[in-house]
């Protein structure tokens, strides 16, 4: 039985050219986390494997940094980064838990509330 829940930063906004932390937290399960995948729509951004550590997809190496923790930091944001992001927790024996975050990248003058949603 899958008892776990994923807590995410939810819907967030950030300024163009800035950076943002995407964060998910798995709780309410003692299942072993074997790997966490970060995906944007159908594109793999990064993998954190329990044994092998982090792997950042080559096409995102310049703008994606691992952490903090199992989170992901996106840098040098562009308007094209707007969209859905998914954290996918692969666990044993439960299976897969998925969290969703919607990021909106705004022109500097518009993103006045974005900071409220960022995790320090």
């Amino acid at each position: 039985m899958m008892t776990g829940t994923i807590e995410t930063t939810g819907n967030i906004s950030a300024e163009k050219g800035g950076s943002i932390i995407l964060q998910c937290h798995l709780s309410s399960t003692t299942a072993q986390v074997t790997q966490v995948n970060w995906e944007q729509q159908d594109q793999l951004l990064a993998i954190c494997n329990a044994d092998l550590g982090w792997h950042i997809s080559p096409s995102f190496k310049d703008r994606v940094a691992p952490g903090p923790g199992l989170g992901l930091t996106l840098q040098s944001l562009t308007v094209n980064d707007t969209g859905e992001y998914f954290c996918i927790y692969h666990t044993y024996p439960d299976g897969t838990y998925t969290g969703r975050i919607f990021l909106e990248v705004l022109e500097s003058s518009v993103a006045e509330h974005g900071a409220r949603f960022q995790i320090p």
Epitope: T3, T30, Q32, A50, G69, L70
Partner: antibody, heavy 116, light 108 residues
Framework: QVQLKQSGPGLVQPSQSLSITCTVS????????VHWVRQSPGKGLEWLGV???????DYNAAFISRLSISKDNSKSQVFFKMNSLQTNDTAIYYC??????????WGAGTTVTVSS | QIVLTQSPAIMSASLGERVTMTCTAS???????LHWYQQKPGSSPKLWIY???NLASGVPARFSGSGSGTSYSLTISSMEAEDAATYYC?????????FGAGTKLELK
């Protein structure tokens, strides 16, 4: 203020069962899991099991045959029962709240001595 | 199960001294799921450092934590009398959840 208050007997006869109640305040049992951990001089800190916000449980395989954890959300109480106690079950038993896979607040503990 | 080995078992430090204790896991632990608790005699354990390096509320900034994989450590930059206690590492990576045997830190 988040608190977990424990009540239960201090002395248990060998082969008898142990029942401890953990009454929580400052948060709802429908939102957080509560774990049970014991501490003895011989074995240190041992995780025993957990009851999740939805009411399902996970147990340490070493104790699954004689351990039961339940709760009453309306009374903010978690109930711990362990059967067939032996002298090596003598320990301090703690309940603790889980947040993001760590224990942020612990009860004061219930000291249990198994002796005839 | 994951065995956590803490060293040293007992150590003493003078006021102002830098203190480091280690926790070695028998298999890899994701750093987000390695935590430290402080316990003083007659009291229950208190969350001290969570997810390897984050200080719990009220913990002095002289404490820090680091590590990854199978090797973790807790450091006190300058020992104070109130730091005398036993420190336990704890993994929530895999069931059964386990704790180290503790490092007892005494004031010299």
């Amino acid at each position: 203020q988040v608190q977990l208050k424990q009540s239960g007997p201090g002395l248990v006869q060998p082969s008898q069962s142990l029942s401890i109640t953990c009454t929580v305040s400052g948060f709802s049992l429908t939102s957080y899991g509560v774990h049970w951990v014991r501490q003895s001089p011989g074995k240190g800190l041992e995780w025993l099991g957990v009851i999740w916000s939805g009411g399902s449980t996970d147990y340490n395989a070493a104790f699954i045959s004689r351990l039961s954890i339940s709760k009453d959300n309306s009374k903010s109480q978690v109930f711990f029962k362990m059967n067939s106690l032996q002298t090596n079950d003598t320990a301090i038993y703690y309940c603790a709240r889980e947040v993001r896979r760590y224990f942020d607040v612990w009860g004061a503990g219930t000291t249990v001595t198994v002796s005839s | 199960q994951i065995v956590l080995t803490q060293s040293p078992a007992i150590m003493s430090a003078s006021l102002g001294e830098r203190v480091t204790m280690t926790c070695t896991a028998s298999s890899s632990v994701i750093s987000s799921y390695l935590h430290w608790y402080q316990q003083k005699p007659g009291s229950s354990p208190k969350l001290w450092i969570y997810s390897t390096s984050n200080l719990a509320s009220g913990v002095p900034a002289r404490f820090s934590g680091s590590g990854s994989g199978t090797s973790y450590s807790l450091t006190i930059s300058s020992m104070e009398a109130e730091d005398a206690a036993t420190y336990y590492c704890h993994q929530y990576h895999r069931s059964p959840l386990t704790f180290g045997a503790g490092t007892k830190l005494e004031l010299k």
